[in-house]
């Protein structure tokens, strides 16, 4: 059971300092940005972080939204991450869920974070180069020391 | 209680090849990996590689790469590791040990090799 | 390839000793670090995770700290079934590196 707490806004980076944006199409990309560009961007780089209590104990539980004309949510449905058209639920009814990520810091680093699926036990998010493309993806890892699975939460409230 | 069982000790000679099995035996949850590791006589431990279970992806030691193949049977639960072109500094005790998280109190997540086999004794000698 | 220097190679004590074995990592591994026990004949046994963490069934005379590069085995008090090599392990990146391993030898 998660049930819904605050929200923050918030900009995401990875560990090259490049900024998680959601593009015309609806893919979380990766880019290099300038903090006016990131800015100007606006508010495909600001990320609505909800906290949900956790009814097991397992790290912070959240969503990862954006609102551009309609809220989507960060789903890692079937292990493939894309942004759904739906606002975060107040509630819900079970211990897994799709949209639903621990964020945790990295042990002795408080500003570096990881993000593991409540669906999938050892997956977590992370920045995969993809042609010229920096993606966001879900990653069975088992390498926890790897710089692709952490990213640094900024505060924009 | 997850217990690994290996197969027996192994003879053999420069050049040749060897397989050492390592089967699974008790519940053991989704999520983990097969490790090999060696310790020679007289030197310590060596980490060779390991194996997912999941989709069979490996990743191997530098040093071992070109001789070395993890495999894994999955409806038997059992793995392999086989090593080519035997020298004589082969010679070693082999292990396989599961990898799976274990989890701190705030569920922070961290891999550990918990279970171990018994070991497998190979001596490679002309 | 990340080199985990571990120290003492070998040290000789007496039961009640308190002894302290360290491990020095070539680059920040966080606290993805693990200590195992081997002894003659036997499969190593996992003693400490996550650098600080007591295995469930391992004697609480058995303590780990450390975080980064520098990390640090101790047993408070020798107990006589302790003697045994000891090794740290890396799990942060592949490969996976341990240290060459503390023999503990009765004094």
């Known amino acids: 059971y998660f049930g819904k707490l605050e929200s923050k806004l918030s900009v995401i980076r990875n560990l090259n300092d490049q900024v998680l944006f959601i593009d015309q199409g609806n893919r979380p990309l990766f880019e290099d940005m300038t903090d006016s560009d990131c800015r100007d961007n606006a508010p495909r780089t600001i990320f609505i972080i909800s906290m949900y209590k956790d009814s097991q104990p397992r790290g912070m539980a959240v969503t990862i939204s954006v609102k551009c004309e309609k809220i989507s949510t960060l789903s890692c449905e079937n292990k493939i991450i894309s942004f759904k058209e739906m606002n975060p639920p107040d509630n819900i009814k079970d211990t897994k869920s799709d949209i639903i990520f621990f964020q945790r810091s990295v042990p002795g680093h408080d500003n570096k974070m990881q993000f593991e699926s409540s669906s999938y036990e050892g997956y977590f998010l992370a920045c995969e180069k993809e042609r010229d493309l920096f993606k966001l993806i879900l990653k069975k890892e088992d390498e926890l020391g790897d710089r692709s699975i952490m990213f640094t939460v900024q505060n924009e409230d | 209680q997850v217990q690994l069982v290996q197969s027996g000790a192994e003879v053999k000679k420069p050049g040749a090849s060897v397989k050492v099995s390592c089967k699974v035996s008790?519940?053991?949850?989704?999520?983990?990996?097969f490790h090999w590791v060696r310790r020679r006589p007289g030197k310590g431990l060596e980490w060779m590689g390991r194996i997912d279970p999941e989709d069979d992806s490996t990743k191997y030691a530098e040093r071992f790469k070109d001789r070395v193949t993890m495999t894994e049977d999955t409806s038997t639960d059992t793995a392999y590791m086989e090593l080519s072109s035997l020298r004589s500094e082969d010679t070693a005790v082999y292990y396989c040990t599961t990898w799976r998280i274990y989890r701190d109190s705030s569920g922070r997540p961290f891999y550990v090799m918990d279970a171990w086999g018994q070991g497998t004794l190979v001596t490679v000698s002309s | 390839d990340i080199q985990m220097t571990q120290s003492p190679s070998s040290v000789s004590a007496s039961v009640g000793d308190r002894v302290t074995i360290t491990c020095l990592a070539s680059e920040d591994i966080y606290t993805y670090l693990t200590w195992y026990q081997q002894k003659p004949g036997k499969a190593p046994k996992l003693l400490i995770y996550g650098a600080n963490k007591l295995q469930d069934g391992v004697p609480s005379r058995f303590s780990g700290s450390g975080s980064g590069t520098d990390f640090t085995l101790t047993i408070s008090s020798l107990q006589p079934e302790d003697f045994a090599t000891y090794y740290c392990l890396q799990g942060s990146k592949f490969p996976l590196t341990f240290g060459q391993g503390t023999k503990l030898e009765i004094k």
């Open positions: 008790g519940e053991i949850s989704t999520g983990y990996y």
